[in-house]
């Protein structure tokens, strides 16, 4: 029972994690314009892995895709690759784990096969989670580096007369979604690996013992019967309440009700 619960929970946690990785990969807010200690602009910039967006204070938002491969920074390409690898591995892991679930019976699949599949999906989830965490962390590191570089050259004077304020970018919501999602996928994978150990059939060989009774020759062979949780095990209906994760497109919507500018 504990094995089934661990496997089921691992599957659900990984499923949520992979959904989060997909959401983070698609989100536009990987980096958002830094508002702290900056002149107040009526334009808010934010960037994702696939496009950059500008939201004017009027509410008008314009997004432009990065319609180039060669012109993009290698780091951005690496982050994209890591996230996609994470999604692909996670998706395959989910597919494998569905068939590995103890509560699902497919033909006459052996417990050992289910155990192997559970381990395989667990490893896939772990690698998927690590890919997502690595991708998000590489991007975050890139942001931190650029942030301090742009702070150092924040005002590039033209003959001391005209000042050009450089737009600085800070962590966007997608980074936090990615970190959490990657962590969940990783935890789910570990849980699947733990469940695999409980699923593997123990090789307990009982020697057949013959009892010679008077008159009859009856051989009792104690069969290796196992207590198994049946298909119709008494599992209560559980409702999973999704907290309704929303993508914050309003990140900048000007902080307080009354601003003096």
């Amino acid at each position: 029972m504990a094995v089934t619960a661990c496997q089921g929970l691992g599957f659900v946690v990984s499923l949520i994690g992979i959904a989060g990785i997909i959401a983070a990969t698609c989100m536009d807010q990987w980096s958002t314009q830094d508002l702290y200690n900056n002149p107040v602009t009526a334009v808010f910039n934010y960037q994702g892995l696939w496009r950059s967006c500008v939201r004017e204070s009027s509410g008008f938002t314009e997004c432009r895709g990065y319609f180039t491969l060669l012109g993009l920074p290698a780091m951005l390409q690496a982050v994209r690759a890591l996230m996609i690898v994470g999604i692909v591995l996670g998706a395959i892991g989910l597919l494998v784990s569905i068939f590995a679930l103890k509560c699902i019976r497919i033909g006459s699949m052996e417990d050992s096969a289910k155990a192997n599949m559970t381990l395989t999906s667990g490893i896939m989830f772990i690698v998927s989670g690590l890919c997502a965490i690595a991708g998000v962390s590489v991007f975050a590191n890139m942001l931190v580096t650029n942030f301090w570089m742009s702070t150092a050259n924040m005002y590039t004077g033209m003959g001391g007369m005209v000042q050009t304020v450089q737009t600085r970018y800070t962590f966007g919501a997608a980074l936090f979604v990615g970190w959490v999602a990657g962590g969940l996928t990783l935890i789910g994978g570990v849980m699947m690996c733990i469940a695999c150990r409980g699923l593997a059939p123990e090789e307990t060989n009982y020697k057949a013992v013959s009892y010679h009774a008077s008159g009859h020759s009856v051989a009792y062979k104690p069969g290796g019967f196992k207590a198994s949780t049946g298909f119709g095990s008494n599992t209560k209906n559980k409702k999973i309440y999704d907290g309704g994760a929303r993508t914050e497109d309003e990140v900048q919507s000007y902080p307080s009700k009354h601003d003096y500018v």
Epitope: C53, V165, V261
Partner: antibody, heavy 119, light 113 residues
Framework: QVQLQQSGAELMKPGASVKLPCKAS????????IEWLKQRPRHGLEWIGE????????KYNVKFKDKATFTADTSSNTAYMQLNSLTTEDSAIYYC????????????WGQGTTLTVSS | DIVMTQSPSSLTVTAGEKVTMSCKSS????????????LTWYQQKPGQPPKRLIY???TRESGVPDRFTGSGSGTDFTLTISSVQAEDLAVYYC?????????FGSGTKLEIK
Amino acid sequence: QVQLQQSGAELMKPGASVKLPCKASGYTLTGYWIEWLKQRPRHGLEWIGEILLGSGSIKYNVKFKDKATFTADTSSNTAYMQLNSLTTEDSAIYYCARKGLRGNSFDYWGQGTTLTVSS
Amino acid sequence: DIVMTQSPSSLTVTAGEKVTMSCKSSQSLLNSGNQKSYLTWYQQKPGQPPKRLIYWASTRESGVPDRFTGSGSGTDFTLTISSVQAEDLAVYYCQNDYYYPFTFGSGTKLEIK
């Protein structure tokens, strides 16, 4: 079509307060920023601030922090600007304008209210 | 605050002539995110409120005659009227709509001979 109606003229005494209306027709105020501007002959145009109807978000030019207060009544589709402690320096034409959906600039303007502060 | 400097303060031309007026800002109005400059040109005729002619430095407002052209980027901007008409008699203002508080130039008064 979009129109912003303002009262024609106001004559006030120094130290008094005045509430200038800006009634929108042809569109719903909610979701648009209403801008308030001041124009004096030798001072050009000055931006006082803006109010986003529906959200209650307000931005004031720090120069007018203690002078202007913005309010709105969505039921009558009207925005208001109250000017306190009037002085002769407040004598000007006050415009309300709507911030357009593109470019952060003002696509429709009221005809303006001429405020005269005189004892 | 951003300072907007317009020149000349006034100019007198004959109908049909080409006119250019300049506007400079103390800081760049170019947004790196979309490579647009947040500068607007307004026309104010006597006794009327200002009317938007050009936004994003070069995008003409619908209904504005194509003799009006805005150009420039960053800190230097120009409004050109290719062939001045009698009805163009007005004061032309440029406005920073990138930084708060929004600021206006002192205006260029166009007079027709």
